[in-house]
């Protein structure tokens, strides 16, 4: 079917558009172009004579319209006359006629628009604000903006006048903003310029900074004072009713008690012509003495001595308040507090309890802290250690042992060897050792202020020969799939090294196995049943090698899920029922049964005489392993047939 | 093939009227105006009017406003001009006729007599 | 309303001769001028359209020109069956007939 198609369908003035045809038929004489929705000889653009090629003038012709050899029609410079529809008129060879009609129309290129106002300075909560798009434009559709947004929903907002007209009712200060108008039209869309609409607004009541309102003696009183206005409010200050000064602060250096009283800041705004006041009272106090912290026992010791700090100096009607580690008391039995407050005590110190340590005295204004005390806190010594940890040693090396024991005053230590005193020194030096140098060496630290001592033995072998070494474990029954073991091999000899075996085998790799601590120690993650192996290691140096004896790992595991042997299910009555129930579990589990969920007997085996039909039913197992924690359980169900009902039946254990 | 079909003659009495038909074929009936001329015995062609059969819109030579009526029949594809009033001054041949841009087709004219 | 006027109500010619018969419109008309041969007894006959196009099957010896108000529709080497009456008309505001140009022999 023949048609039209105009491109663009919407024309902007000026410009051009494309009538395009479509399905043209064959064969044709000649075609015409109307304006209009039908052939009119008074309104013809333009025809085209194929044979010839020439284009004929109609009445209706511009000079403004090109006809192409495909029949469609190029109309430049378009003018807003030019809206509405086209008919083409072709004409075939047999004269048999067609006609195909097409519109398009045209929309002027629109201007900017600019925003009118009926009130530049409306006055907030009072007066109406009436904008208006500019200029007035036919078929043109208005829009406006609120910083960049489009309108919000508000009653207070009416669009009118074809949306040309925005109305703001009862303005308020929130509607100081940008405000753009847009016209748009198919063709064009065009923005005004912002205007920012000015709402004279206040002043709001005034706010005066800052808050406190008291104060000590010989500080500076500065009040500001500010009140949400448009334009910016004009300030004037009173105390005790007594006009001071217009602006928005007010000074006064080094303030006595005297200065007390109400002070009363006032906002006017000269265009709304409206005034607001706020009144604070101010109170000065006299100054307070700094307080400081008294202690009855300024070297306690550990476990022993209690301490009383009593914050200084003693005021009636006064808060007193303590910090420790610059946090407030924490709630502890050993920590007392005197019914004034103004004495902390600490019962039985530790080392932990040095501070340090503040109080504070609170008056109207604020509090006053002292300066922090510390507690020299009398400890140890504790258990001295002795490092390195080896015990074994190869002749002809340097021994070198160190001792240190917490303590507070530090320690003073003294070595012994088998017994006999040695020297008064924190280390130990004895140089190219022999066998003879074999013994228990002990190391004491004494706290010579609170007298105590402590000592720690040591026994140091020296010798060509590495010893049989052994197995420590750190968990003598772990539970599969749940704990990990870590074997050491016992003792630490320097210049040695370690190995493990595993069933004869050495090691085998595995993402469960790790070595550490230079191979002496061995752990097992999420051990399993398989882990139940003898673990041996070995010791060697450049002199000899030692194995320790196996240690098998016991794994606890299980209960798995039981099997209930024999596995038939049918039975003929007056057979024996013999069930015995099997579970894989370390230790072995405790076993029970329940026939149709009746509990029954404890023991692995469930044996019932000559059944019956009535023995039908569901025949539970249930394992327990104390051990581990775990249960499990099996369900069987039994049919017992009446005799000779069903051949092939099981006769029974 | 485009035929239009007329009466050949008509006679009337002087103050009565007539309604002349022109039987429209070989073409869309309704996409084409028709036109209608009168020619007096040795005179010229005088543009009548013209009347559209898709909506009946019509265009009157402003001489035959009130004298001649013109309206379609589009189930019978006919065009009709009613002349009303008549007297010696409307005796002439009257032809239909759709004249276009390389489309022009002529009816044979109806001769109307006006007589008593 | 357009008048066009045709001058010469008859012109007088021979077989083989040239003849041009003219027609003026009352204002500018464009091209928008059709011309139209009318033998006795036989409706009128379309020669020309846009002033100077001649419709298919019509024998070259016709030939329109002009524009705008003077058009002039010229028979060259004139034929025995060219004796005929000839009518201009404008198609550019509604339909109007010049009153025609009998051409016959000398």
């Known amino acids: 079917k023949l048609t039209i198609e105009s491109t663009p369908f919407n024309v902007a003035e000026g410009k051009e558009v494309l009538l395009l045809v479509h399905n043209l038929p064959q064969h044709l004489f000649g075609y015409s172009w109307y304006k209009g929705e039908r052939v009119d000889g008074n309104r013809q653009i333009i025809g085209y004579v194929i044979g010839t090629q020439q284009a004929t003038p109609g009445p209706a012709y511009s000079g403004r319209e090109i006809i192409y050899p495909n029949a469609s029609l190029l109309i430049q410079n378009i003018i807003q006359n030019d809206t509405g529809f086209y008919t083409l008129h072709v004409i075939k060879s047999d004269l048999v006629n067609e006609e195909a009609t097409g519109q398009f129309r045209v929309y002027p290129e629109l201007p900017k628009p600019s925003i009118s106002s009926n009130n530049s300075k409306p006055v907030e909560d009072k007066d109406a604000v009436a904008f208006t798009c500019e200029p007035e434009t036919q078929d043109a559709t208005y829009l406006w903006w609120v910083n960049n947004q489009s309108l919000p929903v508000s009653p207070r907002l009416q669009l009118s006048n074809g949306n040309r007209t925005l109305t703001l009712f009862n303005v308020t200060r929130n509607d100081t903003a940008s405000y753009k108008c847009e016209t748009q039209n198919p063709v064009s869309a065009r923005r005004s310029d912002s205007v920012i609409l000015n709402v004279l607004y206040g002043p709001d009541a005034p706010t005066i900074s800052p808050l406190n309102t008291s104060y000590r003696s010989g500080e500076n009183l500065n009040l500001s004072c500010h009140a949400a206005s448009n334009p910016p409010a004009q300030y004037s200050w009173f105390v005790n009713g007594t006009f001071q000064q217009s602006t928005q602060e007010l000074f006064i250096p080094n303030i006595t008690v005297n200065n007390s009283g109400s002070y009363t800041c006032q906002a006017h705004n000269s265009d709304t012509g409206l005034n607001r006041t706020t009144v604070t009272t101010i109170t000065v106090y006299a100054e307070p003495p700094k307080p400081f912290i008294t202690s009855n026992n300024s070297n306690p010791v550990e476990d022993e001595d209690a301490v009383a700090l009593t914050c200084e100096p003693e005021i009636q009607n006064t808060t007193y308040l303590w910090w420790v580690n610059n946090q407030s008391l924490p709630v502890s039995p050993r920590l007392q507090l005197s019914n004034d407050n103004r004495t902390l005590t600490l019962l039985s110190v530790t080392r932990n309890d040095v501070g340090p340590y503040e109080c504070g005295i609170q008056n109207e204004l604020s509090v006053d802290h002292s300066d922090p005390v510390i507690l020299n806190v009398l400890y140890g010594p504790d258990d001295p250690t002795i490092s390195p940890s080896y015990t074994y040693y190869r002749p002809g090396v340097n021994l070198s042992l160190s001792c240190h024991a917490a303590s507070n005053p530090p320690a003073q230590y003294s070595w012994l060897i088998d017994g006999n005193i040695q020297q008064h020194t924190q280390e130990l030096f004895i140089s190219n050792i022999t066998e003879k140098n074999s013994g228990l060496y002990t190391c004491q630290a004494n706290n010579s202020a609170s007298g105590h001592s402590r000592t720690t033995v040591k026994t140091i072998t020296v010798s060509a020969e590495l010893p049989k070494p052994s197995i420590s474990s750190n968990n003598s029954k772990p539970v599969e799939d749940k704990d990990a073991v870590a074997f050491t091999c016992e003792p630490e000899a320097q210049n040695t090294t370690y190995l493990w075996w595993v069933n004869g085998q050495s090691l085998p790799v595995s993402p469960r196995l790790q070595l550490s601590n230079g191979n002496r120690t061995l752990t097992l993650f999420n051990v399993t049943r398989n882990d139940a192996r003898a673990y041996v290691c070995g010791i060697q140096n450049s002199v000899s090698a030692n194995r320790s004896d196996p240690v098998t790992l016991d794994v606890l595991y299980g209960p798995d899920t039981p099997i209930i042997s024999p596995p038939d299910s049918s039975y003929l009555s007056g057979a024996n029922l013999n069930l015995s129930c099997h579970s894989a579990s370390n230790p072995s589990p405790q076993y029970s049964w329940r026939i149709n969920g009746i509990p029954q007997q404890h023991t692995q085996v469930l044996f019932i005489a000559k059944i019956t039909p009535n023995n039908n039913g569901t025949y539970a197992c249930f394992v327990s392993n104390l051990a581990t924690g775990r249960n499990n359980s099996i369900v069987k169900s039994i049919t017992v047939s009446a005799s000779g009902t069903s051949p092939g039946l099981s006769a029974g254990a | 093939q485009v035929q239009l079909q007329q009466p050949g003659a008509e006679l009337v009495k002087p103050g009565a009227s007539v309604k002349v038909s022109c039987k429209a074929s070989?073409?869309?009936?309704?996409?084409?105006?028709m036109h209608w001329v009168k020619q007096r015995p040795g005179q010229g062609l005088e543009w009548i009017g013209r009347i559209h059969p898709s909506d009946s819109d019509t265009n009157y030579n402003q001489k035959f406003k009130g004298k001649a009526t013109l309206t379609v029949d589009k189930s019978s594809s006919t065009a009709y001009m009613q002349l009303s009033s008549l007297t010696s001054e409307d005796s002439a041949v009257y032809y239909c006729a759709i004249v276009e841009w390389m489309f022009d087709y002529w009816g044979q004219g109806t001769t109307l007599t006006v007589s008593s | 309303d357009i008048v066009m006027t045709q001058s010469q109500k008859f012109m007088s010619t021979s077989v083989g001769d040239r003849v041009s018969v003219t027609c003026k419109a009352s204002q500018n008309v464009g091209t928008n001028v059709a011309w139209y041969q009318q033998k006795p007894g036989q409706s009128p006959k379309a020669l020309i359209y846009s002033a100077s196009y001649r419709y298919s099957g019509v024998p070259d010896r016709f030939t329109g020109s002009g524009s705008g108000t003077d058009f002039t529709l010229t028979i060259s080497n004139v034929q025995s069956e060219d004796l005929a009456e000839y009518f201009c008309q404008q198609y550019y505001s509604y339909f109007t007939f010049g009153a025609g140009t009998k051409l016959e022999l000398k």
């Open positions: 070989g073409y869309t009936f309704t996409s084409y105006w």
